[in-house]
Interface confidence: medium
């Protein structure tokens, strides 16, 4: 059956300077390929975090994704700023051999509202 990506929260509100968790789980680790978080959609979407080892300032994974059969790809964003507002999508990709990775499933999106402190 097709992998399913779930973001249970429709929205989260966070005060500027605080941290927030964006929840995402998948039903399967197959097909092989990374999970990435984006803000926005289409041409303007911005890569926020990738579970592929790179360093992303202010963002880290919540659970240990190196553990076998871990299905939780939630992230924590710390020291949130007004520029962090927007809709975040957790996206599953299928790894390409020579061609680029292919997006196969996206979560429904979680809108982040940033409140003035």
């Amino acid at each position: 059956t097709e992998v399913k990506v779930t973001q249970p929260e429709k929205s989260v509100s966070v005060a500027a300077g605080d941290s927030t968790i964006l929840n995402c789980t998948v039903t399967s680790l197959l097909p092989v390929g990374p999970i990435r978080w984006y803000r926005g959609v289409g041409q303007s979407r911005l890569l926020i975090y990738s579970f592929t080892g790179e360093h992303f300032p202010r963002i880290r994974n919540v659970s240990d994704t190196t553990k076998r059969n871990n299905m939780d790809f939630s992230i924590r964003i710390s020291n949130v700023t007004p520029e962090d507002a927007g809709t975040y999508y957790c996206v599953k990709f299928q790894r390409g051999s020579s061609e680029p990775d292919t997006e196969i499933q996206s979560g429904g999106g979680t809108e982040v509202y940033v409140l003035a402190k």
């Epitope: 399913k4 249970p8 429709k10 989260v12």
Partner: antibody
């Protein structure tokens, strides 16, 4: 105080159509996703359809897909359910239900309107 | 689609007794579970969300617990107004949103 008032129910023959309305007040209607949930006589609750605050996102239960259409008019604070090709098994009390702003559970419900499909 | 199974179907108890209602999910819904109360001729009313958080205005004799696939609604001491049908609902999965079949709490 949040109020949801359904109307438009009644007795209708199989194959015919009916349009339900839900008038909302006491909250910023356009900011909330709203749903239709039904309950057949003596039975449990069955989710029917969902529409997002902007109207851009819509979901249906498989049992009504292709026959029912959910819509909303944010300028009138009103939710609609257009029901076509009605069947006996669509007989139920239809409730409109306002979702929580963060999660998909229902913190406010209307009183319901009864739809009876019978020849 | 996530299936919710409630048990028992009917619970016959006396006022003052403790009621324990169960809801089992076909797959993990973490703590994304709500409980509703419905009295005859009335709309459902939200009691519990997040598996254990009481909704506004709900008396503290109502409590929810559980996570994953097993959930419990407990009414510590039944009052006359608590005799009703109770439904669980998961909101972890993207629609279709699903309800359990209900548990009727009746006077013994």
């Amino acid at each position: 105080e949040v109020q949801l008032v359904e109307s438009g129910g009644g007795v209708v023959q199989p194959g015919r159509s009916l349009r339900l309305s839900c008038a909302a007040s006491g909250f910023t209607f356009s900011s909330y996703d709203v749903n239709w949930v039904r309950q057949a006589p003596g039975k449990g609750l069955e989710w029917v359809s969902l529409i997002s605050g902007s109207g851009e996102i819509i979901y249906y239960a498989d049992s009504v897909k292709g026959r029912f259409t959910i819509s909303r008019d944010n300028s009138k604070n009103t939710l609609y359910l257009q029901m076509n090709s009605l069947r006996a098994e669509d007989t139920a009390v239809y409730y409109c239900a306002k979702e929580n702003n963060r999660y998909r559970f229902f913190d406010d419900w209307g009183q319901g309107t009864l739809v009876t499909v019978s020849s | 689609e996530i299936v919710l199974t409630q048990s028992p179907g009917t619970l016959s108890l006396s006022p003052g007794e403790r009621a324990t209602l169960s809801c089992r999910a076909s797959q993990s819904v973490y703590t994304y579970l709500a409980w509703y109360q419905q009295k005859p001729g009335q709309a459902p009313r939200l009691l519990i969300y997040g598996a254990s958080s009481r909704a506004t205005g709900i008396p503290d004799r109502f409590s929810g617990s559980g996570s994953g696939t097993e959930f419990t609604l407990t009414i510590s001491s039944l009052q006359s107004e608590d005799f009703a049908v109770y439904y669980c609902q998961q909101y972890y999965d993207r629609p279709p949103l699903t309800f359990g079949g209900g548990t009727k709490v009746e006077i013994k």
